[in-house]
């Protein structure tokens, strides 16, 4: 019977001849009557036999990750009659692991949006990383995360590629980060190769700001012959908030005379000051109102933004109109 | 802390001419509208004129329109009254006051300084 | 324009005495907007009374100030050495006027 125990070439040696192991029948007794043959795919260009020990070598260099077993014949034959000495026989040879593939992030570019402000712990994204090295042969593929830029905001999970946030962030003082993961194969161990992935976290906004009057005081006049529903002047809040986190409403706070009032344009997000009565310069010529300010959307988790409404001080004076 | 202190002041013959001036300090004075009042011996206070914090509007005492020219010069922090044509009854002691921002009245006040229009 | 009226003309009352002064208008005063100052000889007026009620800081709280509309007051409730000047109200609602003054005097 054929005798030969399982056979394994490292890939990627670069030695010419690589004595894999012996084929040999135990009918053999060692005189050169037998001659070994090897059939199959890769027999003769990547695998050779010596006919008469048996003895098998890998004369190419492998690459586990192109193919990892080859599945070859062999025969022996007695050289004086030309007989098979024992019938054909199938055997494999495989085709171990080195680590010799780093690991790579198929899936770039990443992006993700996470709130501003959203609280340490939430999940951000996960980065995964693939290794083309046998995951069953030793530490080879199995892979640890790390974060190499992105500190103090960001952690990632060495086991998963989750990344989390870490610590609170601002929209307002900056609005997106590049977060480098790297991932490195060997569990960490020396000869570990590694790949690096970078991500885009954008933060979206939230009302986490209150409108504020660009100026505390606001000097407007007014005719004494403009009629009810004039426009006499526009007042202007900022909020560093964007989209509908920055619409606002402008209402009074203070008109003892009860003659104006403030209208929101909400395409300009300006307050408008309109004479609600009409004004005489011989009895009144200096009016004073309050206005306020306030977003148009406030959750109910963010009303600790929005405690005080910011107000300002308009000064209208009425403009003499020669009477006839 | 606010200081208002007036100057120019003395005597001139009907007719003729004279700058008073009042030099400010210890506030932003180009955020601030000023104005004159002047009090004749032994007399009442009486409102002169008014300029806004950036020169854009002035307003006068019907007594002294056409007459005096309210003006301020706010790199230099210093309001000015120019008084043409002054007359006997414009003999008073002049003092430059600072508006209240929020309001109309007058918070801080000059020491004066004392006009007599007399020939 | 407004003419403020103020009444009476000298009052003549001892230290420790309350001082009541009156001022009244002859159109109505919008949005209160009516102030008292002080003055003494030989100096410029000090602000006391904004709003017609309002105290400025710094000023003791035996001065206050009522009033709406046409009158207004200023009251002195304990009168100190130093309260002995002439007082003038004035308004802002419509340009600026002031009073004719109450002179407060030592009896």
């Known amino acids: 019977g054929w005798v030969w125990n399982q056979f394994f070439v490292p890939e990627e040696m670069n030695t010419t001849s690589h004595h894999i192991g012996q084929l040999r029948s135990d009918l053999d007794n060692g005189n050169n009557s037998f001659q070994y043959k090897l059939l199959g795919a890769g027999a003769g260009s990547t695998f050779i036999i010596d006919e008469r020990t048996g003895d098998i070598y890998a004369i190419q260099k492998l690459d586990r990750e192109e193919r990892s077993l080859y599945i070859l014949r062999a025969q022996v034959i007695d050289i004086a009659t030309g007989r098979a000495v024992e019938p054909e026989s199938e055997f494999v040879i495989k085709v171990s692991d080195i680590n010799d593939n780093e690991p790579k992030f198929l899936d770039e570019p990443y992006e993700a949006i996470v709130p501003e402000m959203s609280p340490e712990g939430t999940l951000v994204i996960q980065v995964t990383a693939s290794d083309a090295d046998d995951p069953s042969s030793g530490n080879n593929a199995r892979l640890l995360y790390s974060l190499l830029q992105g500190q103090p905001y960001f952690s990632v999970e060495p086991t998963t590629g989750v990344i989390r946030i870490s610590s609170k962030m601002d929209r307002e003082l900056q609005d997106e980060y590049w977060v480098i993961i790297q991932a490195k194969d060997m569990i960490g161990q020396p000869g570990a190769l590694s790949g690096t992935t970078s991500v885009l976290i954008k933060l979206s906004d939230v009302n986490d700001n209150k409108p504020i009057f660009k100026e505390s005081l606001y000097r407007l006049t007014v005719s004494e012959s403009a009629p009810t529903g004039t426009s006499i002047g526009t007042i202007m809040a900022y909020d560093n908030d964007i989209g509908e986190n920055a619409e606002m409403d402008y209402s009074i706070e203070e008109d003892d005379s009860q003659t104006f009032d403030i209208i929101t344009n909400h395409e300009t997000q300006e307050g408008i000051v309109i004479l609600k009565k009409k004004v005489d310069f011989e009895h009144q010529n200096h009016y004073g109102i309050r206005a306020k300010v306030k977003n148009h959307h406030v959750p109910e988790q963010l009303m600790k933004y929005h405690t005080e409404a910011s107000t300002t001080f308009i000064k209208i004076q009425v403009e003499d109109v020669d009477e006839p | 802390q606010v200081q208002l202190v007036e100057s120019g002041g003395g005597v001139v013959q009907p007719g003729r001419s004279l700058r008073l001036s009042c030099a400010a300090s210890?506030?932003?004075?180009?955020?601030?509208?000023m104005h004159w009042v002047r009090q004749a011996p032994g007399k009442g206070l009486e409102w002169v004129a008014v300029?806004?914090?950036?020169?854009?509007?002035?307003y006068y005492a019907d007594s002294v329109k056409g007459r005096f020219t309210i003006s301020r010069d706010n790199s230099t922090n210093t309001l000015h009254l120019q008084m043409n044509s002054p007359r006997a009854e414009d003999t008073a002691v002049y003092y430059c006051?600072?508006?209240?921002?929020?309001?109309?009245?007058?918070?801080?006040w000059g020491q004066g300084t004392l006009v007599t229009v007399s020939s | 324009e407004i003419v403020l009226t103020q009444s009476p003309g000298t009052l003549s009352l001892s230290p420790g005495e309350r001082a009541t002064l009156s001022c009244r208008a002859s159109?109505?005063?919008?949005?209160?907007?009516l102030a008292w100052y002080q003055q003494k000889p030989g100096q410029a007026p000090r602000l006391l009374i904004y709003?017609?009620?309002s105290r400025v800081t710094g000023i003791p709280d035996r001065f206050s100030g009522s009033g709406s509309g046409t009158d207004f007051t200023l009251t002195i409730s304990r009168l100190e050495p130093e309260d002995f000047a002439v007082y003038y109200c004035?308004?802002?609602?419509?340009?600026?006027?002031f009073g004719q003054g109450t002179k407060v005097e030592i009896k």
């Open positions: 210890g506030f932003t004075f180009s955020s601030y509208d």
């Open positions: 300029i806004w914090y950036d020169g854009s509007n002035k």
């Open positions: 006051a600072r508006e209240y921002r929020y309001s109309w009245y007058f918070d801080y």
């Open positions: 004035q308004q802002y609602s419509n340009s600026w006027t």
């Open positions: 159109q109505s005063v919008g949005s209160s907007y």
């Open positions: 709003g017609a009620s």
